[in-house]
Interface confidence: medium
């Protein structure tokens, strides 16, 4: 059974992940971002189901495409550090989902834009956090 300290750690890691995903989304939605239209042409795979921490496998598998899109989107008005940012997110995802169980991610038939993709995982984080508090 999870202890209160492990639950607290999980909650903090989820909050960390949530904030980083929100930062990316805020950057993309920034009124100054000139490459938003182009960014929306890239398609991301969405999880068929995302209700447990093991489902973060689906996010992990899409981190490389996310990094590539963020790299392409770099401009004067949209400056992130994709390599470091995605590396930070990857570390949290690995810690949260654990490496003990091998979970095969199932994806939905419909692909999504980067905005829809980020919103989906932001909602996931918020949902899990609410069950922990």
């Amino acid at each position: 059974a999870p202890t209160s300290s492990s639950t607290k750690k999980t909650q903090l890691q989820l909050e960390h992940l949530l904030l980083d995903l929100q930062m990316i989304l805020n950057g993309i939605n920034n009124y100054k971002n000139p490459k938003l239209t182009r960014m929306l042409t890239f398609k991301f795979y969405m999880p068929k189901k995302a209700t447990e921490l093991k489902h973060l496998q689906c996010l992990e598998e899409e981190l490389k495409p996310l990094e590539e899109v963020l790299n392409l989107a770099q401009s004067k008005n949209f400056h992130l550090r994709p390599r470091d940012l995605i590396s930070n997110i990857n570390v949290i995802v690995l810690e949260l989902k654990g490496s003990e169980t091998t979970f095969m991610c199932e994806y939905a038939d419909e692909t999504a834009t980067i905005v829809e993709f980020l919103n989906r995982w932001i909602t996931f984080c918020q949902s899990i956090i609410s069950t922990l508090t």
Partner: antibody, heavy 121, light 110 residues
């Protein structure tokens, strides 16, 4: 208005770890939209970026210092901290903390008053 | 990696106009925003220009910034020089890996 204040030991022995804290007042680290940065200036010399951190705890470091630097954040205390390990005399400098926008580019405003750290035995 | 090169020092009389250059050694100066900081002796830097040509509130319009792609340089121009403008000025930019500062220019108001 937002103010930043550095604090920590002014003297550190070679090979030890330099530890500094920046306390933010007049605004909240948790409000988002900004990274929180450390920059240093060697005596009589130019400025050097060390790294910055987001409220989430995600940190980004200068490639030249990455192996020795750790930046952490404590949103409950409205503080962020710098640790620089294995210091030498070359790390003697005035250390500044500053605020940086997250998306529209890396620049620094406002800056703290700075704190001089001397590395000497 | 690249470098930002500034003149070591410039001097001009009160009331005149002075321009400080900042040349990027490789890559386009226009690809990322350039900032300028003023540092008076014994004080911390303050921003006088951000995002190439934007002035923070409280900075007089005597200060202006520009980018010249042909010379791959940025410039800080100060008109109507005052003795209080005497300070070190640093340009600064960044890329997806690092942050870069120029070596600084000492402005002397004669």
């Amino acid at each position: 208005q937002l103010q930043l204040q550095e604090s920590g030991p002014g003297l550190v022995k070679p090979s030890q770890t330099l530890s500094l804290t920046c306390t933010v007042s007049g605004g909240s680290i948790s409000s988002g939209g900004y990274y929180w940065s450390w920059i240093r200036q060697h005596p009589g010399k130019g400025l050097e970026w060390i790294g910055y951190i987001y409220k989430s705890g995600s940190a980004y470091y200068s490639p030249s210092l990455k192996s020795r630097v750790t930046i952490s954040v404590d949103t409950s205390k409205n503080q962020f901290s710098l640790k620089l390990s294995s210091v030498t005399a070359a790390d003697t400098a005035v250390y500044y903390c500053a605020r940086t926008p997250t998306v529209t580019g890396d620049w620094f405003d406002p800056w703290g008053r700075g704190t001089l750290v001397t590395v000497s035995s | 990696n690249f470098m930002l090169t500034q003149p070591h020092s410039v001097s001009e009389s009160p009331g005149k106009t002075v321009t400080i250059s900042c040349t990027r050694s490789s890559g386009s100066i226009a690809s990322n925003y350039v900032q300028w900081y003023q540092q008076r002796p014994g004080s911390s830097p303050t921003t006088v220009i951000y995002e190439d040509n934007q002035r923070p509130s409280g900075v007089p319009d005597r200060f202006s910034g520009s980018i010249d792609s042909s010379s791959n340089s940025a410039s800080l121009t100060i008109s109507g020089l005052k003795t209080e403008d005497e300070a070190d000025y640093y340009c600064q930019t960044y890329d997806s890996i690092d942050v870069y500062f120029g070596g600084g220019t000492k402005l002397t108001v004669l």
